[in-house]
Interface confidence: medium
């Protein structure tokens, strides 16, 4: 027979039929089925099928009238070429039917990973996503949704390169993997999270630095007088996208909510397009980028704002230790500290004697006085960019007291 073999696909563990078109009234002498390596089965009318290969026992059957070959519990080893030799009664010529059997595994859910991000001109980003299915190598076709003009597929569809600006909508991309027996789709991937600093290092207005207080609200200014007439404003921070579209309330992408699942703490003012954050958290600190968009979704201008966040300082604690008291001179070491102050706290002591020694960011003070002199009353003031807090140290009865104390 000159025609190409019939291609049949089966699922690993499933069943498959290699069909023969033998009509009921055809008088058959016998049918021999030959497998990828050797003869498999012999069938004759009104007789039991003879199976010749051990590995097919219990998995192979030949249908009564059409003599089609049925294989169940398919293994990867079953794949290959099959041939049916059909011998009709009173018919000298043997008819042959050829088949090619492919056995495929059911696909698992495709995984999408970000391969690379390249920042290009005009504040745009080229993001390369890769789609793969665990355990599947051959015969897997990949496709992506949405199929956009500015997204290109390569490597048989498994790689998608998307070009986008912050002004483009952050669409969810879905990878669909397909083989002849199954089709699976990935979870949606928002590419906006991979491109949150396009062109930020090059150009745009160098915005100001804004100082905020932990737990309190803050406004990051954009100072767009005609904010209401702006098509769209997008603020980017880390993997968060906060946007305000014309004639619409400002919306925070689900990504922003991932930082605070209980409350939407971030929004864009419809008055001046500034970014407002309530109840500041330490992780809100960092560089923010604002992009003003045109109707055609291109970036018309960009501003950077750096947000610094500090705690309101609690009252400092003063600890002291007596170094030694002799010759009528009292010598002590003082240390001033603020709980949760962090490394941005500055300490000052007042009034400071000429011979006093201050060390370690001014938190430590060595001081001495004669018993004939007035006992110094010292004040430690802790300060950071958003607050100041003081504590007075009373030195009387120190030299006659215990070796260490806290005030």
């Amino acid at each position: 027979k000159d025609s190409a073999p019939t291609v049949v696909s089966g699922i690993l563990g499933g069943s498959v039929t290699l069909p023969l078109n033998i009509s009921v009234d055809t008088e058959i002498e016998n049918v021999i089925w030959i497998g990828p390596k050797n003869a498999l089965a012999f069938a004759r009318p009104k007789e039991n099928v003879t199976i010749m290969v051990k590995s097919y026992l219990g998995r192979l059957d030949i249908t009564k009238w059409s003599y089609s070959l049925c294989i169940s519990n398919l293994t990867l080893n079953d794949a290959g070429s099959y041939k049916a030799q059909i011998n009709q009664r009173n018919f000298e010529v043997t008819t042959e039917e050829e088949f090619t059997l492919f056995v495929y595994e059911q696909l698992q859910e495709p995984q999408v990973t970000m391969k690379s991000v390249k920042v290009s001109e005009n504040f745009s980003c080229n993001i390369t996503l890769m789609c793969s299915v665990k355990g599947a190598e051959k015969s897997v076709l990949y496709s992506w949704t949405p199929r956009e003009p500015h997204a290109s597929e390569s490597n048989g569809g498994s790689i998608l390169t998307v070009s986008r600006t912050p002004c483009d909508p952050d669409l969810p991309y879905i990878c669909t993997a397909q083989n002849p027996v199954s089709q699976r789709s990935s979870l949606p991937v928002h590419v906006g999270q991979f491109c949150t600093d396009p062109g930020a290092s090059r150009g745009g207005t160098t915005g100001e630095t804004v100082v905020g207080v932990l737990g309190e609200p803050v406004t990051l200014p954009l100072a767009l007088p005609a904010c209401r007439d702006t098509e769209k404003v997008v603020w980017l921070f880390n993997t968060s996208i906060i946007s305000k579209e014309r004639e619409e309330a400002a919306t925070a992408d689900p990504l922003i909510k991932s930082r605070d699942p209980y409350k939407n703490r971030v929004w864009v003012s419809s008055q001046d397009c500034s970014l407002k954050i309530s109840q500041l958290k330490i992780e809100d600190a960092g560089p923010y980028h604002a992009y003003v968009c045109s109707e055609a979704s291109s970036v018309t201008s960009m501003t950077h704002v750096t947000l610094l966040i500090y705690r309101r300082l609690r009252k400092p604690k003063i600890t002291w230790s007596l170094r030694h008291s002799e010759d009528g001179i009292c010598r002590i070491s003082l240390t001033c500290s603020v709980e949760d102050g962090g490394n941005t706290v500055m300490y000052t002591w007042t009034p400071l004697q000429k011979e006093a020694v201050v060390s370690q960011g001014e938190s430590h003070l060595n001081v001495s006085w004669r018993s004939s002199e007035n006992h110094p009353n010292l004040t430690c003031t802790a300060s950071n960019p958003v607050s100041r807090s003081s504590h007075q140290f009373l030195s009387e009865n120190i030299c006659s007291g215990p070796e260490r104390n806290t005030k």
Epitope: E109, T145, A151, Q183
Partner: antibody, heavy 116, light 106 residues
Framework: QMQLQESGPELVKPGASVKISCKAS????????INWVQQRPGQGLEWIGW????????YYSEKFKAKATLTVDKSSSTAYMLLSSLTSEDSAVYFC?????????WGQGTTLTVSS | QIVLTQSPAIMSASPGEKVTVTCSAS?????MFWYQQKPGFSPRLLIY???NLASGVPVRFSGSGSGTSYSLTISRMEAEDAATYYC?????????FGGGTKLEIK
């Protein structure tokens, strides 16, 4: 046999809500996105949104964000669409359809009539 | 969103006649999909990825096009082809459909 079976016709009053169901069979329900499409009388087709049964994640067309809520029950392989604050404008046939990129299988449609 | 405009809106053809339905997109799309819908029934996928025939669709149907211009062709019209045909894109969100072309038999 791959099938999407939708719930029967609904007659509801303006202002009310309605929940339409779409029961899937013949394939692994959690592996495929379920989309919903509206067809108003004598009109064309309009996409409402999708839900991914495995995770429950959803995506809505801007037009239907405030109108439709999509959910699934994995145990019964059923997708649901809740339509709220109904007006006569919502009278239509609603189809569920499987797929991403295109819709390879469709439900038979549920006719919703909103009338006082 | 991308607007798909189909033409003609209504047309009739004799059995055996060649039929072409066009779909014009307001912005470039990468692929077009075509559906057939008969009265009282749900749509049926005919063509996917611009030119690939869906399972069970007769070979007299074909699709072509690129960019903003796409078409569906029936090489020889048959009585069972009388229906409304819709084009659809998913190159950008939201997915959109054309307004439909109603094809009648003469």
């Amino acid at each position: 046999q791959m099938q999407l079976q939708e719930s029967g016709p609904e007659l509801v009053k303006p202002g009310a809500s309605v929940k339409i169901s779409c029961k899937a069979s013949g394939y692994t329900f959690t592996h495929y996105y379920i989309n919903w499409v509206q067809q108003r009388p004598g009109q064309g087709l309009e996409w409402i949104g999708w839900i991914f049964p495995e995770s429950g994640s959803t995506y809505y067309s801007e037009k239907f964000k405030a109108k439709a809520t999509l959910t699934v029950d994995k145990s019964s392989s059923t997708a649901y669409m809740l339509l709220s604050s109904l007006t006569s404008e919502d009278s239509a046939v609603y189809f569920c359809a499987r797929g991403t990129g295109f819709f390879d299988y469709w439900g038979q449609g549920t006719t919703l009539t909103v009338s006082s | 969103q991308i607007v798909l405009t189909q033409s003609p809106a209504i047309m009739s053809a004799s059995p055996g006649e060649k039929v072409t339905v066009t779909c014009s997109a307001s912005s470039s799309v990468s692929y077009m999909f075509w559906y057939q819908q008969k009265p009282g029934f749900s749509p049926r996928l005919l063509i996917y990825d611009t030119s690939n025939l869906a399972s069970g669709v007769p070979v007299r149907f074909s699709g072509s096009g690129s960019g903003t211009s796409y078409s569906l062709t029936i090489s020889r019209m048959e009585a069972e082809d009388a229906a409304t045909y819709y084009c659809q894109q998913w190159s950008s969100y939201p997915p959109t459909f054309g307004g439909g072309t109603k094809l009648e038999i003469k």
